[in-house]
Amino acid sequence: DIIMRPSCAPGWFYHKSNCYGYFRKLRNWSDAELECQSYGNGAHLASILSLKEASTIAEYISGYQRSQPIWIGLHDPQKRQQWQWIDGAMYLYRSWSGKSMGGNKHCAEMSSNNNFLTWSSNECNKRQHFLCKYRP
């Protein structure tokens, strides 16, 4: 049998049953999530659930830039260091950079310091690039 790989929206890239859109415009975390949702298909800020997924995403983004952090779908809505993915995925894989998680930093970004393989927490009202994800 021929199995057709699902297609992603123009400009989005495909990896392991998911489509990803890397948006190079500046949005705060909540506006970024709203923009992801506006694309339909159940899109949200991206959850990153394995090293393989993280590596694929990091390699893709490094082709575009290597200096600006990027919002992902991990946040701490209760502000109690109880992190969760906005798309409801299980928070099992973690890749924090090891920086202090204190202060008013309750949203997660892919850090450019380690080629986007590790995460840092940041203030949610900061405007940054963002990564969306949906399953086609």
């Epitope: 123009p10 400009g11 989005w12 859109g21 890397y22 948006f23 190079r24 415009k25 500046l26 949005r27 506006d31 923009e35 506006s38 082709g63 575009y64 830039q65 405007r127 690039h129």
Partner: antibody, heavy 120, light 110 residues
Amino acid sequence: EVQLVQSGAEVEKPGASVKVSCKVSGYTFTGDYMHWVRQAPGQGLEWMGRIDPKYGDTNYAQKFQGRVTMTRDTSISTVYMELSRLRSDDTALYFCATDNSGLYDAFDKWGKGTTVTVSS
Amino acid sequence: QSVLTQPASVSGSPGQSITISCTGTSSDVGGYNYVSWYQQHPGKAPKLMIYEGSKRPSGVSNRFSGSKSGNTASLTISRLQAEDEADYYCSSYTTRSTRVFGGGTKLTVL
């Protein structure tokens, strides 16, 4: 259908200012950056700057810093480009263009252009 | 003076292939996958032909292709047709978060 509708031709005197508008329809106004690009008669394209309609943030080409101001009115889905202290070499066709929601980093929708003539 | 360098003109016969180059620096063309190409017919607005160096928007013929090597991007048009006669411009994102254009190349189909 996405449309960028620009204001009509302008004739201005040297030293004056001109304000060109670009009205958006067919997509979420606050979703896309809007850029302004000009083209002098018989010349190439020149990027002037861009505005983020969501927040009003701007980024201008160094050449136009201090002379150009880009603004927006979200209530009527319109962006504006004002160029002050006009000179004869500002005579050009002025285009607004969008960059497709930040995915392409390219200008995939263009207005038809507004002719600005600077003459005494 | 344009930041990106393009040949002023190129020409080719119908059915042939031509390539237009666009040379910048590591701060623009060489530093990013952000090169785009535009076609402009006289009196018309430019039309996006290639984005991110080598990707075609829907509706653009597969006769148009883009590539990049180092600080130079290229647009290739295969199987030239009369309607391809136009001006072509490259553009790139820069390290200052600005955009720059090349000076433009006039394509003549002989």
